[in-house]
């Protein structure tokens, strides 16, 4: 039987520490970069190994951010958010939205919050 | 977690050619920066050849520029090693490894700029 993905979203503050390496992490997106068609949102793209995201646990690759330390991520060019998260300072707080996979039914199921519906 | 699974290794002679791959799985392909990775026999596992997660920039070892060749198909989730020339030196199991892309958040200059997350098993190049 053919199936398909559901997906459900969530949002979470995540407060992160600055370590003696940074914040840990890599992103892709902007304006000038789309990573998702039709939405230029800054995506996390790789947590590195031992870094405070890493070492705080709940930042995810493929998790999209909302903002840093309250200041929104739309409509960035990639430089611009890039130099945002590097001037962000010690304490630093991410409004992330995660997408986890729920579920994988048959055909013709439609799952609460399906887009196209 | 991201899954690779190498193929196209073997036996060839010297001047001969090979045509390594390397399938992707368990998330988007076209966020992964890609390399190819040896191991010969008694040494350090040394980075080939890179590409990145747009496909345009690479990175090549000296010792194998001019005649390898990497390059990506998103579309297929898979990342080719084309090796023409092959020298006995060459051989080596080859690795296949991925990392996410993207800009760092805290430096220009990435220090582990070869350090990557995920690994596939190896293939077989022996070149006699």
């Known amino acids: 039987m053919n199936g398909r993905v559901d997906y459900l979203v969530t949002e979470e503050e995540i407060n992160l520490t600055r370590g003696p390496s940074g914040l840990g992490f890599n992103i892709v997106g902007g304006t000038d970069q789309q990573y998702v068609s039709n939405d230029s949102g800054i995506y996390v793209s790789r947590i590195k190994e031992n870094g405070a995201a890493a070492l705080d646990g709940r930042l995810q690759e493929g998790d999209k951010i909302l903002s840093v330390n309250g200041q929104d991520l739309k409509n960035l060019l990639h430089q611009d958010a890039v130099d945002l998260f590097r001037n962000a300072g010690y304490a630093v707080s991410l409004r992330v939205q995660h997408r986890l996979q729920v579920q994988n039914g048959p055909i013709g199921h439609r799952g609460e919050g399906d887009p196209s519906g | 977690e991201v899954q690779l699974v190498e193929s196209g290794g073997g036996l060839v002679q010297a001047g001969g050619s090979l045509r390594l791959s390397c399938a992707a799985s368990g998330r988007p392909f076209s966020s992964l920066d890609m390399g190819w990775f040896r191991q010969r026999p008694g040494k350090e596992r040394d980075v080939v050849a890179t590409?990145?997660?747009?496909?345009?920039?690479?990175y090549y070892l000296d010792s194998v520029k001019g005649r390898f060749t990497i390059s990506r198909d998103n579309a297929k989730n898979t990342v080719f090693l084309q090796m023409n020339s092959l020298k006995p030196e060459d051989t080596a199991v080859y690795y296949c490894?991925?990392?996410?892309?993207?800009?760092?958040?805290?430096?220009?200059?990435?220090?582990?700029?070869?350090?990557?997350?995920?690994w596939g098993q190896g293939t077989q190049v022996t070149v006699s």
């Open positions: 490894a991925a990392r996410g892309g993207g800009s760092s958040v805290d430096s220009e200059y990435d220090v582990g700029e070869f350090k990557y997350d995920y």
């Open positions: 590409i990145n997660w747009t496909g345009d920039s690479t």
